[in-house]
Amino acid sequence: NIDVCKLGTVTVQPAPVIPLGSAANISCSLNPKQGCSHYPSSNELILLKFVNDVLVENLHGKKVHDHTGHSSTFQVTNLSLGMTLFVCKLNCSNSQKKPPVPVCGVEISVGVAPEPPQNISCVQEGENGTVACSWNSGKVTYLKTNYTLQLSGPNNLTCQKQCFSDNRQNCNRLDLGINLSPDLAESRFIVRVTAINDLGNSSSLPHTFTFLDIVIPLPPWDIRINFLNASGSRGTLQWEDEGQVVLNQLRYQPLNSTSWNMVNATNAKGKYDLRDLRPFTEYEFQISSKLHLSGGSWSNWSESLRTRTPEEEPVGILDIWYMKQDIDYDRQQISLFWKSLNPSEARGKILHYQVTLQEVTKKTTLQNTTRHTSWTRVIPRTGAWTASVSAANSKGASAPTHINIVDLCGTGLLAPHQVSAKSENMDNILVTWQPPKKADSAVREYIVEWRALQPGSITKFPPHWLRIPPDNMSALISENIKPYICYEIRVHALSESQGGCSSIRGDSKHKAPVSGPHITAITEKKERLFISWTHIPFPEQRGCILHYRIYWKERDSTAQPELCEIQYRRSQNSHPISSLQPRVTYVLWMTAVTAAGESPQGNEREFCPQGKAN
């Protein structure tokens, strides 16, 4: 703390504010009758330099002038930008125990003259807003710098306002609080900014603008949409705008979209008809405004209006498939399946499906509605049947889709050839085939159908299918395809009134099975052994099983076991072997093989054949 300079004074030449790179002389003088009490000649004046309240230097060696015991002058150089504190202290050299006594102090500010302000920009937000201007101040001056914003305009009027920058605040924007009204649309305004500090002053170049240049309309508000006759594709967008607006920009998009539809509307007066909307779709609408057709700035976008367009009747046709199962000699069960319409076809919430099964001669018609995407009925095995399905929402129903019910695999001549299934990656399978060799009627389309080969899958899970045009011989199936699961894949060739099919198994990824089949029994019949087993549990198969292997060897033998490889068939769970010696005890076990390799062995069973063996 400096005790208000009771002992003396400190002065700075040329001034306490100096340009960067300049030197200054600091003089410290004692007041009369002040100093070391007994020996005035022993007065020693020292100068200490502080930056941010930290002592950084004793300037004892920088004395340029000395009146012993009365005053001293120090030269200071290389001062850094900002403020530096210098404190003069009195050291009474005969008294070593007493610390030097503060005499007085001074702050020297080092800075630069302001640069001319640049890039002046003025804006008035809305017709009732006020003019605010901002600018680029240029390099930091490190000194308190005053800025005067001066706006000159019509009626011989000049408006001005001031602010300052220092080490605590920056001044590069001022709101003049004055409103420019539309009656000044043709008037010109001139704005300039002047900067002044202790080292100099500078002025910006004058910047000229008009009302239209700077007034940015407020964004439109109170946006709403009215759908004409509850139409899902046509609506009138309405909004409120400032009075002088002549041009609007509208943008709208479905909520899940990434690109906007843009429309320019001249003299819309808060109203615009849209004709290309998608029914039953969540849309986002925004509007921007401009006060002049060619000049001026667009307003910010309005707040979004989010709304859903009304429903319209469904369009498009349902993709139908079916399964036939004979129940007994005169009845069959027909299960119809169909895929949901995509949203652009459904055009609303599908409330139900209208299903019709009709015998072609019109003797019998079964009709029903269902909320599900499948329908099962028992019908006579006689007659030619056709099915149709249509989807209904609150506005109406789609055109019915018809399909002829034929014996899907009844015609061998229509069976596709050389069907193969190759795994493409983790979640799809490429199915290829060749057309039927001797079809006596043209193939209208192929259906590729697939279902996981797991217990109860026929009853529990609907099939998945793809319709393929007659000139294509491949399909990439991916819907509900999971790795390490085996699928039964059927390729159907359909003509107008017949069907032929070929079947294959396939998987998208495989591993060796987790375990081998479990041998449940070994029985001897007519000099042959029958091995019975239970299949590997579905989750442990890890893909399509290609073969089972039955291994056997004499108990306690160290020889390699013999083996018999059986082509995998789901329906088969026993197999005969006939090369075992009677009255010799054997150990038997089984493994399973996928395209990825062989499983560990299943359980071991011992057996000693009794009868004669070949």
């Epitope: 009732n128 006020t130 305009g153 019509p154 009626n155 011989n156 009027l157 408006c159 001005q160 306002k161 001031q162 709101d175 003049l176 609080g177 004055i178 409103n179 420019l180 009204s181 009656d183 000044l184």
Partner: nanobody, 127 residues
Framework: QVQLQESGGGLVQTGGSLRLSCAAS????????MGWFRQAPGKEREFVAA????????FYTDSVKGRFSISGDGAKNTVYLQMNSLKAEDTAVYYC????????????????????WGQGTQVTVSS
């Protein structure tokens, strides 16, 4: 009852200075513009300067720009007009006036937009 009371007028030589004061009472003028108008004999009342309290903006007519300076003391509800380098053509009765929002460029310099007026103080500049 709103009252505006001017003071500080008088006789001064060309090139001299005067400081006019206008004390407002009866309400606060924090959202107002307080201005000075003048009327020379046989002439229409003309705008001189104004201060927008809330924004801190000052307004001047071109003929006094650089010579006159307007300021205010919110605590005292008083506005001042410092007049330097006075000329003979500055001779007039000087009126203090106040206006309510909105504050439009078109309105600032026009006397009909000011709702409150003082009685005036005479300023005479002699050569």
């Amino acid at each position: 009852q709103v009252q505006l009371q001017e003071s500080g007028g008088g006789l001064v030589q060309t090139g001299g200075s005067l400081r006019l004061s206008c004390a407002a009472s009866g309400r606060t003028f924090s959202n107002s513009v307080m201005g000075w108008f003048r009327q020379a004999p046989g002439k229409e009342r003309e705008f001189v300067a104004a201060l927008m309290w809330s924004a801190g903006s000052e307004f001047y007519t071109d003929s006094v720009k650089g010579r006159f300076s307007i300021s205010g003391d919110g605590a005292k509800n008083t506005v001042y007009l410092q007049m330097n380098s006075l000329k003979a053509e500055d001779t007039a009765v000087y009126y203090c006036a106040a206006k309510n929002p909105p504050h439009r460029w078109s309105d600032i310099g026009k006397s009909p937009h000011y709702e409150y007026w003082g009685q005036g103080t005479q300023v005479t500049v002699s050569s």
